[in-house]
Interface confidence: medium
Amino acid sequence: EEELQVIQPDKSVSVAAGESAILHCTVTSLIPVGPIQWFRGAGPARELIYNQKEGHFPRVTTVSESTKRENMDFSISISNITPADAGTYYCVKFRKGSPDTEFKSGAGTELSVRGKPSAPVVSGPAARATPQHTVSFTCESHGFSPRDITLKWFKNGNELSDFQTNVDPVGESVSYSIHSTAKVVLTREDVHSQVICEVAHVTLQGDPLRGTANLSETIRVPPTLEVTQQPVRAENQVNVTCQVRKFYPQRLQLTWLENGNVSRTETASTVTENKDGTYNWMSWLLVNVSAHRDDVKLTCQVEHDGQPAVSKSHDLKVSAHPKEQGSNTAAENTGSNERNIY
């Protein structure tokens, strides 16, 4: 009679994580009598996967019920596959004895596990940066297999080209990770912009995963200042305004100085938002010119988002206005908030 052969028809099997893997094995003869065992790997360190004679293998079931005489199908199904299950599986025929002795092995079936990449996580720089500066964004995704993966960067739908990507580890592994760094040049219009990292993998069936970062968390747009003198409201009063334009984020503190002395400090509250996401704010100072004998240097000083202060000054020509007798005060007014400075 022809000698028994152990046939594993599939050289390789690929299964998505979480699914079941069926590993096929048949034998060609009933002789010699003895059990079949399944192993992962070969050699002395091989791992026993299934042996009904002894042991407990809750994830393994037999494909054939093998409750017929002369059964020759020893295929198994392994449930809830994870990347850790990847490897080469051998169906091995033993000859019955005390103990059973290995008689013949199948050629092996390589099980590869298709693991989905995790949702990409995009992170930006720790500190804010201003327009015209280049900032780096990183994108990370883990746990995918096989190794082949595609990563793209977009800014507002436009694909970026300045990035570097690494997939680790370089050698064989049960699962892989990807790390990519993209460089993005900021513009003043980027408050509403988004940077997107897009990952495509065979397990995603053409529906890539995306991670996003809002540039509003990265950008700082410094304000432009303009100090103007409004027409005289009353005979001895001049309204001076400081227009703070196009700044982001909103955190801003404004100080008025008269000839270098602090007159008033306030925090931006009722700002107006521009279409591009930046803010405008206006502060005004009502100056009683009759309180001054000499010209007054008015300075609008702005500290934005913890950065060094920027300022803009305006010279108020006192000589151009008649002085009011008996008055020695300059009154400032912003809205309903009035204070007298002596």
Epitope: I31, V33, K53, S66, T67
Partner: antibody, heavy 124, light 110 residues
């Protein structure tokens, strides 16, 4: 838990037909095979036949000509019919749940659960 | 088709060790697996050994099975004999499509 229970007449006339029922609970007849085993008084047990999980049957060749095994999976019952009974068919009749050890070319059958048995006497 | 032969009876003292043989009449004892069953009077049999030497988890480790090719026999060994071990014991194997039982052995604990 797994339970098997045989039922049928305790007394059968010679040359008549024996009908036994095995009612099971705790497992599915679609997943396990069942055998009938009898033990004549003062002798060792004798395997009579098997109802496979998929509905096929196998019989002891010495009894095949007068034995029939069937089932009703909806009622969880397996039936034995044996005709032309003689006095030497007297004994205890058991239904047993079969286990086979996967990975042997002749799956090693052993009987992991037995019913309590029913005594059948063939006498006029 | 082979037969399996067991002694009609075996006896042993309490806490002693006994062995019940089961001899195969033709063919090699190693050509098929052997199981053993215990039957107390008035109770259904229970499987105590399967696949020559495997013990179901619920069975005491005082029970063990083996095969001996020189005598073409399987054996059931019970150590530290207890009164409750007094019962009938029978072996079982198979030939092609037929399951074959031994005639049974009555174990008496003295």
């Amino acid at each position: 838990q797994v339970q098997l229970k045989e039922s049928g007449p305790g007394l059968v006339q010679p040359s008549e037909t024996l009908s036994l029922t095995c009612t099971v609970s705790g497992f599915s007849l679609a997943s396990y095979s069942l055998s009938w085993v009898r033990q004549p008084s003062g002798k060792g047990p004798e395997w009579m036949g098997r109802m496979y999980y998929d509905g096929d049957t196998a019989y002891n060749s010495a009894l095949k000509s007068r034995l029939s095994i069937s089932r009703d999976t909806s009622k969880n019952q397996v039936f034995l019919k044996m005709n032309s009974l003689q006095t030497d068919d007297t004994g205890t009749y058991y239904c047993t749940r079969d286990r086979s050890m996967f990975g042997t070319d002749y799956p090693h059958w052993y009987f992991d659960f037995w019913g309590p048995g029913t005594m059948v006497t063939v006498s006029s | 088709q082979f037969t399996l032969t067991q002694p009609k009876s075996v006896s042993g003292a309490l806490r002693s060790t006994i062995t019940i043989p089961c001899e195969r009449s033709s063919g090699d004892i190693g050509d098929s697996y052997v199981s053993w069953y215990q039957r107390h009077l008035g109770r259904p049999p229970i499987n105590v050994i399967y696949a020559d030497d495997q013990r179901p988890s619920e069975v005491s480790d005082r029970f063990s099975g083996s095969i001996d090719s020189s005598s073409n026999s399987a054996s059931l060994t019970i150590t530290n004999l207890q009164m409750d071990d007094e019962a009938d014991y029978f072996c079982q194997s198979y030939d092609s499509k037929i399951d074959i039982f031994g005639g049974g052995t009555k174990l008496t604990v003295l």
